[in-house]
Amino acid sequence: QLPPGKPEIFKCRSPNKETFTCWWRPGTDGGLPTNYSLTYHREGETLMHECPDYITGGPNSCHFGKQYTSMWRTYVMMVNATNQMGSSFSDELYVDVTYIVQPDPPLELTVEVKQPEDRKPYLWMKWSPPTLIDLKTGWFTLLYEIRLKPEKAAEWETHFAGQQTEFKILSLHPGQKYLVQVRCKPDHGYWSAWSPATFIQIPSDFIMNDHHHHHH
């Protein structure tokens, strides 16, 4: 029987910069029941606080609700693991909420086949940013990525759309049914999950284009 091994806080995420959650990995348990506590202070403070919510984020987590989350202050936190034989501490972790945002997927993905008379046909798609993200403040830049594939294909084809919320793709296989998804990330944050798949049937008379794709 031994003191617990060193835990590691390995992940922190915020869906919208208004709340966030951090998760830790326990070290070895030393063969005894182990209690974990997360303590933190914010930049400019000396007073240490204990995690306000160990429940919401699931096992080995700490959730900071709205009243505990500040975008203006860096959080300095560590996890203490304790059993009957002793304690061990994680390394200190510094968290700036700006840099841990992982948004919800984009919304309202619509996909259409456009067949203008004077030009080659193309696949046109548009979407909306996730509702929890406030883009009006200006500091939040969302980047988008699209992926699509024929229904029975194994490999996805991905396209980076930058900050745009619409996109054209010119090169598709006629007669195929395609799955299309979109995801987003803040410039220094994390990719969202992919949006639910939208299906689109490419007409059999769709003419392949040499130019692969272009932004709208």
């Epitope: 700036d96 700006t98 990330k185």
Partner: antibody, heavy 118, light 112 residues
């Protein structure tokens, strides 16, 4: 203990490429961005770019765009910086550095001297 | 790119005496999220740089309290209240508000 251990010194010819490695240990490699910073002899520090090892998303200093490629290998917890079309002005010590969930550099590698000479 | 200008270029200080380094940026370092990402690093002779101060005035873990940072907007200062022999090296200010991140030219601190 967090460690960033870089590959050894290199001597390269003008026009060639160099690839410097940075092996991370003591933490979960995919959790934090890795940055590359260089320092020419007797000069200051210059930020080259950064990578998020979780998905290999990169941002580069436009000054190096097209010449620098930053990659990460999750299986070996190693980041790489490749600089191509080398010229004598690229002679420098190249550092990798790690952030937290922040945008400043908390841990630094020991540096790799790259000498470009004909 | 944001240009960071440090003064003085070098500083020779008697142990126990204070020292002050100034850093000026060519544009405001207030991020649109309200934070100011101005940091100070020390590069001791023959070593890699090490973080001293983050976000203007916050000492990094293990940094002695004789180091303090202040300033806002475009003008920032690093102060050492009582210089010790181990403080010798080159001090750099750095901004990470705007990409590309940039560094000042450095201030060399020597002991008299």
């Amino acid at each position: 203990e967090v460690q960033l251990v870089q590959s050894g010194a290199e001597v390269k010819k003008p026009g060639s490429s160099v690839k410097v490695s940075c092996k991370a240990s003591g933490y979960t490699f995919t959790s934090y961005w890795i940055h590359w910073v260089r320092q020419a002899p007797g000069q200051g520090l210059e930020w080259m770019g950064e990578i998020d090892p979780s998905d290999s998303y990169t941002n580069y200093n436009q000054k190096f765009k097209g010449r620098v490629t930053i990659t990460a290998d999750k299986s070996t917890s190693t980041a790489y910086m490749e600089l191509s079309s080398l010229r004598s002005e690229d002679t420098a010590v190249y550092y990798c550095a790690r952030s937290f969930f922040t945008n400043w550099f908390a841990y630094w590698g020991q540096g790799t001297l790259v000498t470009v000479s004909s | 790119d944001v240009v960071m200008t440090q003064t003085p270029l070098s500083l020779s200080v008697t142990p126990g005496q204070p020292a002050s380094i100034s850093c000026r940026s060519s544009q405001s370092l207030v991020h649109s999220n309200g934070n100011t990402y101005l940091h100070w690093y020390l590069q001791k002779p023959g070593q890699s740089p090490q973080l001293l101060i983050y976000k203007v005035s916050n000492r990094f873990s293990g940094v002695p309290d004789r180091f303090s940072g202040s300033g806002s907007g475009t003008d920032f200062t690093l102060k050492i209240s009582r210089v010790e022999a181990e403080d010798v090296g080159v001090y750099y200010c750095s901004q990470s508000t705007h990409v590309p991140f940039t560094f000042g030219g450095g201030t060399k601190v020597e002991i008299k």
